[in-house]
Amino acid sequence: MMTGTIETTGNISAKKGGSVILQCHLSSTMAQVTQVNWEQHDHSLLAIRNAELGWHIYPAFKDRVAPGPGLGLTLQSLTMNDTGEYFCTYHTYPDGTYRGRIFLEVLESSVAEHSARFQIPLLGAMAMMLVVICIAVIVVVVLARKKKSLRIHSVESGLQRKSTGQEEQIPSAPSPPGSCVQAEAAPAGLCGEQQGDDCAELHDYFNVLSYRSLGSCSFFTETG
């Protein structure tokens, strides 16, 4: 029975004229790897790594295909024609054959440089946006609570004149600074029993936000 899985570098991009490492890894099996074949998009051979015979590089690629690291392959002096699928085929004993796929996109030098130049500022801008969204959420939550507590206090002061003055406890726990609300629905403390348009809008806002913030912020779960 074949229990192993091939893990690959997946979809990768590299600069024209540069180099890239194609890497596959066989895991979850004790099978012995006897040979690894590397093939290009049209299934033409690039290289073979045999456990006993070493490496065989297809002659036409000898100048720009380097063996390794490990069972991987390094493609050098990349051209636009190198864009496409690459396959690693693992022959193993006793399992048999495993196959992995990698997609390589070769980018024009200017495009690659452009993307590299703007990648860091872009990440910074995204991080800033997340921080701003988080702060906005906190402000909305705090303001909404204040508004509600003011409303409750005015109602209570009216009630206290008519009744024994029993006070209603509303759980209140503000989000810690720099964190986001993990919201599957708008927190109950904000909407309570009200089901008006404003509350529905806020409900949707929190749902959208929860998708955007997952994995980017530390979560604070509020129960209402």
């Epitope: 006897t34 040979q35 051979l45 045999n50 015979l53 065989h56 590089i57 002659p59 036409a60 004993y93």
Partner: antibody, heavy 119, light 107 residues
Framework: QVQLQQPGPELVKPGTSVMLSCKAS????????MYWVKQSHGKSLEWIAF????????TYNQRFRGKATLTVDKSSSTAYMHLNTLTSDDSAVYYC????????????WGAGTTVTVSS | DIQMTQSPASLSASVGETVTITCRPS??????LSWYQQKRGKSPQLLVY???TLPENVPSRFSGSGSGTQFSLKIDSLQPEDFGNYYC?????????FGAGTKLELK
């Protein structure tokens, strides 16, 4: 076209050594491994070793380790096999062959050199 | 080592006949098998590699098939120049080994 030139027969004394050559032409010498194969009289073929002229690395059949040594001279596109401490068991035809495009098979063969070990 | 058992050791056939030679490696070699033809006093020549692929210069009457531990070389409509010795070779591990050969003779 691809050609592998091997010299004529060699008559050598037991205990001595011999250097066999194989001159390649008609292709990019460094791109293909060069193989050496032994064929004793009336017998089958035995792979000895191969060498990759690109990096000088060679792979041997364990049976011939210590008996054969492969080298290349890229400037003259020539492969060499040195056989030492010769005995009558080493009497055979020795072929050089260019490796295949797609693996460890032998795509083009030389005419062979007959080595006779005799006192 | 992977042992290559070739059969038959020899066979006689006439021009125009079809013949099949088989090769059985002692273990699974996938499709990493080649076939060679050697005429008397000449060096071997590649006929088939990777079990079924023919080099450009080889006539289409030759065909290879098989995988794992069972391979065969078929020659359709034998020609006078086809008589000689045939060898199989695996290219899947060290040492590379050849079969003992099949001698194809004219009947």
């Amino acid at each position: 076209q691809v050609q592998l030139q091997q010299p004529g027969p060699e008559l050598v004394k037991p205990g001595t050594s011999v250097m066999l050559s194989c001159k390649a032409s008609g292709y990019a010498f460094s791109r293909y491994s060069m193989y050496w194969v032994k064929q004793s009289h009336g017998k089958s073929l035995e792979w000895i070793a191969f060498i990759d002229p690109y990096n000088g690395g060679s792979t041997y059949n364990q049976r011939f380790r210590g008996k054969a040594t492969l080298t290349v001279d890229k400037s003259s596109s020539t492969a060499y096999m040195h056989l030492n401490t010769l005995t009558s068991d080493d009497s055979a035809v020795y072929y050089c062959a260019r490796g295949g495009d797609y693996g460890w098979y032998l795509g083009v063969w030389g005419a062979g050199t007959t080595v006779t070990v005799s006192s | 080592d992977i042992q290559m058992t070739q059969s038959p050791a020899s066979l006689s056939a006439s021009v125009g006949e079809t013949v099949t030679i088989t090769c059985r490696p002692s273990e699974n070699i996938y499709t990493y098998l080649s076939w060679y033809q050697q005429k008397r006093g000449k060096s071997p020549q590649l006929l088939v590699y990777n079990a079924k692929t023919l080099p450009e210069n080889v006539p289409s009457r030759f065909s290879g098939s098989g995988s794992g531990t069972q391979f065969s070389l078929k020659i359709d409509s034998l020609q006078p120049e086809d008589f000689g010795n045939y060898y199989c070779q695996h290219h899947y591990g060290n040492p590379l080994t050849f079969g003992a050969g099949t001698k194809l003779e004219l009947k």
